[in-house]
């Protein structure tokens, strides 16, 4: 008779996580009778994946009735495959003994798991940043195989270039992971803007993944002040108003000083949104000029964010004739949008009226 | 190893049934035909059917097909044979044996189990 | 059915000689290129035991003196030194179609 030969076709098969994957194998001779055995692996640590004999191999069946007379049909169906049973599969012949006696394998069937990445996840800074800086966003994509993978990062729908990516492991492995950092420099407009991170793989059928982060997340838009001041009421009061500006996000502190001592603080809350996700928030201030004798400071200090307070003063000049009074205040905005205070006088006439 | 253990002796009467067991250990039950073969006192060996585990196919020896009944308790590894309608010349010793190679042959015995028919 | 018919029925044969048993199928037993042919020892007491397998293969554990020939429907048993240990009743038995064994033949020492 012909010598036994133990045949495995293919030398490798490709399945999709979830799947059955079949391993194909024929002898050409009954003799000599005894059993198969599926390894993955060679060597000394092999692991048994079926043995047609004895053992329970609940996930393993044979394709073949193994008590089909004359079977010469050692294929055998792995059930619901995952990325750990990748690696190399041998149908090995055994001469019936006590023990069994290996007798000749087959060439091996590589058995490679196309397993689906992961929903890609999108981290921004931990910190904000404000316009003009560059922030760094992370996309981590895990459990894929094999380790083709493609990443792209969008801004608003632009390709960025600036980003690095890397899949590890390096070697072979039954799974891996893709972790990749973009760049992005940020404008005042950005409130709005968001990245994506989009990962294509040949499980994926052309369809990628897609990960999302806000940039309303990553960015801080310092506020702009200004004052404005209205005439002189009747009742000797005059209405000045802080505006802050173009600010984001909403968290915001604001305090008026008189003369530097604490006169109110609001906390901005529920206010309207610009179309470009920033807020405005108008504060004002009536001021008692005939409870004055000399000219009131005024400082709209803003506190946004935690960051340092900005403060914008003005001085609002109080007449020394009483007969005048009613009319002769003047008020001047002599403040910057720089954090601390500045505080430039009026001209030395006091008798001068002043409106802005 | 492979080992097959039967049912004891038996001592039945004319007209009368016999169940003999065989249970099976050291392999897969499912994987392997169990043949029954019987032997008269001084005699030839005398197959009379076999079945396999995995989902009950039964051949049977022509001879025996309307008297002798093959079954398998799976979740046991355990083959019985039943023989009905005992005439004397069904005294024997009862044999199962497993068939290693699915070439209807028979590798492993059982000691078997002696069924002796008298009135 | 196919008929097996062994010779002799009995034999007698002295230690270290060769005995042959001969089996012959009413029928061809040949399929697929295999010889559906296997020979069995019974020692007094004992259960049989498979020593030859398709005609011609030697089961695990079995001493090489016992060898099988033969294909179609002509078939041997050959043992090549005869210990005492031989003593036995021998079979054949076929599996072309379903089992039959012949009827066996006694070897007993000269």
């Known amino acids: 008779e012909e010598e036994l030969q133990v045949i495995q076709p293919e030398k490798s098969v490709s399945v999709a996580a979830g799947e059955s994957a079949t391993l194909n194998c024929t002898a050409t001779s009954l003799i000599p009778v005894g059993p198969i055995q599926w390894f993955r692996g060679v060597g000394p640590g092999r692991e048994l994946i079926y043995h047609q004999k004895e053992g329970h191999f609940p996930r393993v069946t044979p394709v073949s009735d193994p008590t089909k007379r004359n079977n010469m049909d050692f294929s055998i169906r792995i059930s619901n495959i995952t990325p750990a049973d990748a690696g190399t599969y041998y149908c090995v012949k055994f001469r019936k003994g006590s023990p069994d006696v290996e007798l000749k394998s087959g060439a091996g069937t590589e058995l490679s798991v196309r397993a689906k990445p992961s929903a890609p996840v999108v981290s921004g800074p931990a910190v904000r940043a404000t316009a003009e800086h560059t922030v760094s966003f992370t996309c981590e994509s895990h459990g894929f195989s094999p380790r083709d993978i493609t990443l792209k990062w969008f801004k608003n729908g632009n390709e960025l270039s600036d980003f690095q990516t890397n899949v590890d492991p390096a070697g072979k492995s039954v799974s891996y992971s893709i972790r990749s950092t973009a760049r992005v420099v940020l404008t005042r407009r950005d409130v709005h803007s968001q990245v994506i991170c989009e990962v294509a793989h040949v499980t994926l059928q052309g369809d990628p993944l897609r990960g999302t982060a806000n940039l309303s997340e990553a960015i801080r838009v310092p506020p702009f002040l200004e004052f404005t001041q209205q005439s002189m009421r009747a009742d000797n009061q005059v209405n000045v108003t802080c505006q802050v500006m173009k600010f984001y996000p909403q968290r915001l502190q604001l305090t008026w000083l008189e003369n530097g001592n604490v006169s109110r603080t609001e906390m901005a809350s529920a206010l309207p949104e610009n179309k470009d996700g920033t807020y405005n928030w108008t504060s004002w201030l009536l001021v008692n000029v005939s409870a004055h004798r000399d000219d009131v400071k005024l400082t709209c200090q803003v506190e946004h964010d935690g960051q340092p307070a900005v403060n914008k003063s003005f001085s609002v000049k109080v007449s020394a004739h009483p007969k005048e009074q009613g009319s002769n205040t003047a008020a001047e905005n002599t403040g910057t949008n720089e954090r601390g205070s500045s505080d430039y006088k009026d001209d030395d006439d006091k008798h001068h009226h002043h409106h802005h | 190893q492979v080992q097959l253990v039967q049912s004891g002796a038996e001592v039945k009467k004319p007209g009368a049934s016999v169940k003999v067991s065989c249970k099976a250990s050291?392999?897969?039950?499912?994987?392997?035909?169990i043949n029954w073969v019987r032997q008269a006192p001084g005699q030839g060996l005398e197959w009379i059917a076999m079945?396999?585990?995995?989902?009950?196919?039964?051949h049977y020896n022509q001879i025996f097909k309307d008297r002798a009944t093959l079954t398998t308790d799976t979740s046991t590894s355990t083959a019985y044979m039943e023989l009905r309608s005992l005439r004397s010349d069904d005294t024997a010793v009862y044999y199962c044996?497993?068939?290693?190679?699915?070439?209807?042959?028979?590798?492993?015995w059982g000691r078997g189990t002696l069924v002796t028919v008298s009135s | 059915d196919i008929v097996l018919t062994q010779s002799p029925d009995s034999l007698a044969v002295s230690l270290g000689e060769r005995a042959t048993i001969n089996c012959r199928a009413s029928?061809?037993?040949?399929?697929?290129?295999?010889?559906?042919i296997f020979w069995y020892q019974q020692k007094p007491g004992q259960p049989p035991k498979l020593l030859i397998y398709l005609a011609s293969n030697l089961d695990s554990g079995v001493p090489d003196r016992f060898s099988g020939s033969g294909s179609g429907t002509d078939f041997t048993l050959t043992i090549s030194s005869l210990q005492a240990e031989d003593v036995a009743v021998y079979y054949c038995q076929e599996s072309r179609e379903l089992p039959t064994f012949g009827q066996g033949t006694k070897l007993e020492i000269k």
């Open positions: 079945i396999d585990p995995s989902d009950s196919e039964t």
């Open positions: 050291g392999y897969t039950f499912t994987n392997y035909w």
């Open positions: 044996a497993m068939d290693y190679g699915s070439l209807y042959a028979m590798d492993y």
């Open positions: 029928k061809s037993v040949s399929s697929s290129g295999y010889n559906y």
